[in-house]
Amino acid sequence: LMGGQDKPFLSARPSTVVPRGGHVALQCHYRRGFNNFMLYKEDRSHVPIFHGRIFQESFIMGPVTPAHAGTYRCRGSRPHSLTGWSAPSNPLVIMVTGNHRKPSLLAHPGPLLKSGETVILQCWSDVMFEHFFLHREGISEDPSRLVGQIHDGVSKANFSIGPLMPVLAGTYRCYGSVPHSPYQLSAPSDPLDIVITGLYEKPSLSAQPGPTVQAGENVTLSCSSWSSYDIYHLSREGEAHERRLRAVPKVNRTFQADFPLGPATHGGTYRCFGSFRALPCVWSNSSDPLLVSVTGNPSSSWPSPTEPSSKSGICRHLH
């Protein structure tokens, strides 16, 4: 991770991808410590911020503008050398987002995947982006970059993620950049949560008063397990969103969540999953599917008594 004998290591916290108007801390690690350092921008634009100044431990940059985008290096203080400074560090690319219209991000075959599978994240736009970047929230490494393919007035790139492991689960966003400004990125796509299932034992799913009910009768689906899951997720076949509830410890030492579906109007096949607060995007095996049948007069859909979660937000904690 660190540089060579006389080469500092330059890093960015929280990320090298910085929204326009945001802040980022640049750290120059030299000889097992954070000492005084100088900072350079390779294209020599926007140099007034450095102006021969010496920084201590870290440099807080911001609020950033498109002019901040580019490649940076640092030199660590080396008092007894000829120049007083180390060799230049590794190059660090700072990308500034929010400069063009956001692209779209889709998952194929879908955002809910089994451990070991591969997912294709497709980033596309009607803006003719030369490059697309894919970034996972909370990661300080550089985003993945692909050249955009232009077809029928649409530019796109397919990022292959896999085989999926818990470390790859999370919230993804993609960005585009136009020619001649490779580090001035677009606004982020809407976030896309990639969820990995099949890591823990399956919960059980049951219906009260039962899986076959009269139209208009109130139905509650209960998801429970001996495992101390923090959150349960309930999905219905054919619906994009899932519902989630905090698990409640019961006297029989199980952990349970009760999903009220309201008055029964329409049947469907339901599954539930458990997850832990520390890894909100890593879910258990699916419960056995539960077919809820409604006798009487079914209408076109089941009203949602609780606000369904959006396609994103799964990977956030429930407060």
Partner: antibody, heavy 118, light 107 residues
């Protein structure tokens, strides 16, 4: 949204100390710094200095070295300004403002009035 | 220390007027100039930084320009809600220093 909330007004006697707090919310506290600015009717806005919330390293303007001290409680996303051995000329409104090494102060606290009088 | 001399210290304008405030630095500050607006009873608010970059949510009637030692804040069509004191600040070298302020009133 980004907010900086400062502690309330203070009335102090000369020679006493005062500690002004500035609680930040709406952003990751350690990715920016906290600047401190004094406003007096006579001198207008004057920069006291700033503290790097990532490294904890403070920097003071020459005129404010000695009796003025910055500190942080990163777990509470709070920055502090302590003024010791207060003098009548320290009577002012003190502002905290988010900012870094580039000196741009993009969000400000509401200000804390400190009055030093016997 | 770099001294920022702001002028005028007071101006009165009618709604819709174009208003210009200038700031002169005692040395070249290489476009590292910010402008703030302070309304009565409120803290200062960032309008512009790096001479011409508008801060998030700032109406586009506010613009900045300049280079070297001379900088300008322009309000293209002043509104009643723009009544405030405006300050320039150099963010080129520490200690960061502010201008004395320009009080803008509406006739």
């Amino acid at each position: 949204q980004i907010q900086l909330v400062q502690s309330g007004s203070e009335l102090k006697k000369p020679g006493a100390s005062v500690k002004v707090s500035c609680k930040a919310s709406g952003y990751t506290f350690t990715t920016a710094g906290m600047q401190w600015v004094q406003k007096t009717p006579g001198k207008g806005l004057e920069w006291i200095g700033w503290i790097n919330s990532h490294s904890g390293v403070p920097k003071y303007a020459e005129d404010f070295k000695g009796r003025f001290a910055f500190s942080l409680d990163t777990s509470a996303s709070t920055a502090y300004l302590q003024i010791s051995s207060l003098k009548a000329e320290d009577t002012a409104v003190y502002f905290c403002a988010r900012g870094g090494d580039e000196g741009v102060m993009d969000y400000w606290g509401q200000g804390t009035s400190v009055t030093v009088s016997s | 220390d770099i001294v920022m001399t702001q002028s005028p210290s007071f101006l009165s304008a009618s709604v819709g007027d174009r208003v210009t405030i200038t700031c002169k630095a005692s040395q070249d500050v290489s476009t590292a100039v910010a402008w703030y607006q302070q309304k009565p009873g409120q803290p200062p608010k960032l309008l512009i930084y790096w001479t011409s970059t508008r801060h998030t949510g700032v109406p586009d009637r506010f613009s900045g320009s300049g280079s070297g030692t001379d900088y300008t804040l322009t309000i293209s069509s002043v509104q009643a809600e723009d009544v405030a004191v405006y300050y320039c600040q150099q963010h080129y070298s520490t200690p960061w220093t502010f201008g004395g302020g320009t009080k803008v009133e509406i006739k």
